[in-house]
């Protein structure tokens, strides 16, 4: 038997993946657990095996179909259960009625690239991955630039309040190495959260032109 409180949190990537984390502060010894997804009106259900991510939390990804297929919409409710094996039977450890479009977390933006770089500015573009057509243009982005001698946590956040998949970074220092990251969030959903940060894009500004001798 398992004692203690548990937390069961899931997010939908807006296409064909529900990622779940289950935390349990009681001890679970060599117990096999899984997440089971049962939509209210779809003719499929799905299961994934919970794998440990720390001493008291487990995670898994429910793969609902091909990455870009629209497996759930705003009309769906999915019953999500954590099931753990107890001898020959399964015990329900946690349950929630999950509204996918109220619990969104998109995939991190991809394909970051430098479009144009100068001494003091750099134009960068990116793409969103596996994002539903339902959002149309209702997305926002946050970006951050890592300057030499600083940490990511110290980097100021730049907010793009519209679906804009590029940014022009200004007031950069010439001949300097920088890194850049971006993340995305739909405007929809009460419990929607930011995507993970993208993989960092490294770039270097151009050196300043040498002044003429006087």
């Amino acid at each position: 038997a398992v004692n203690g409180t548990s937390q069961f949190t899931c997010f939908y990537n807006s296409r064909a993946n529900i990622s779940c984390v289950w935390s349990q502060d009681g001890a679970l010894q060599d117990t096999s657990c899984q997440v089971h997804a049962w939509p209210d009106r779809r003719r499929w259900n799905q299961t994934c095996e919970l794998l440990p991510v720390s001493q008291a939390s487990w995670a898994c990804n429910l793969i609902l179909g091909a990455p870009d297929s629209q497996k759930l919409t705003t009309v769906d409710i999915v019953t999500l259960r954590v099931l753990c094996r107890e001898g020959v039977r399964w015990r329900v450890m946690a349950i929630q009625d999950f509204k996918p479009f109220e619990n969104l977390r998109l995939m991190a933006p991809i394909s970051l690239q430098v479009v144009h770089v100068e001494t003091h500015r750099c134009n960068i573009s990116w793409e969103i991955s596996q994002a539903s057509h339902y959002f149309e243009r209702h997305l926002e982005f946050e970006a951050r630039t890592l300057s030499p001698g600083h940490t990511w946590e110290e980097a100021p956040l730049l907010t793009l309040k519209q679906k804009q998949e590029w940014i022009c970074l200004e007031t950069l220092t010439p001949d300097t190495q920088y890194e850049f990251q971006v993340r995305v969030k739909p405007l929809q959903g009460e419990f929607t959260t930011w995507s993970p940060w993208s993989q960092p894009l490294a770039f270097r500004t151009k050196p300043a032109a040498l002044g003429k001798d006087t």
Epitope: D40, R41, R42, R43, S69, Q70, T73, T74, V75, Y134
Partner: antibody, heavy 116, light 107 residues
Framework: QVQLVQSGAEVKKPGASVKVSCKAS????????INWVRQAPGQGLEWMGE????????NHNEKFQGRVTMTRDTSTSTVYMELSSLRSEDTAVYYC?????????WGQGTTVTVSS | DIQMTQSPSSLSASVGDRVTITCKAS??????VAWYQQKPGKAPKSLIY???YRYSGVPSRFSGSGSGTDFTLTISSLQPEDFATYFC?????????FGQGTKLEIK
Amino acid sequence: QVQLVQSGAEVKKPGASVKVSCKASGYTFSRYWINWVRQAPGQGLEWMGEILPGSGSINHNEKFQGRVTMTRDTSTSTVYMELSSLRSEDTAVYYCTRHYGSFDYWGQGTTVTVSS
Amino acid sequence: DIQMTQSPSSLSASVGDRVTITCKASQNVGTDVAWYQQKPGKAPKSLIYSASYRYSGVPSRFSGSGSGTDFTLTISSLQPEDFATYFCHQYSSYPFTFGQGTKLEIK
């Protein structure tokens, strides 16, 4: 086997209300949305709304908001659809249908005639 | 609301013919489209869900395809019992909507 059996034909006067029943059998009643769809004579299909018997959750077509009431009785596995303030344009066959995949099983239909 | 525009509205064909009915959604509906067959005085009968999945008991001559905004119902070889009216239906977002129907008649 899955069956949805609806109540009989009704004749109503304008301004009155009608309550149509849909009794489900052959599956777990609480688990699947029951939708209501109507079809005026010689016309297409029009979605009115849906109810999830287990929770009582309801979604309406805004066109009918305020005029349609959907309820359920889990003890008899029956769903009800009441339409008020009837007018001649509400003359139609009213169907209940289960949503699983799409509308997979349909009731036989209930003819509602609104006439003065 | 999402409009489902079906074409043609009526169609004359013969037994053995291959028939195609199309449905165009006014917005992207993914694959959340179904097809129904209705005969006079009867309730609709479910044929296809999720654009291309046949319900059990539906003959293999019925097939559906499409995604996004363009959908097709194909009857590969018409049988006498196939003469009826066919409706497409989107259940991607509220309110659910139907095409206006295609009446398939004997030539």
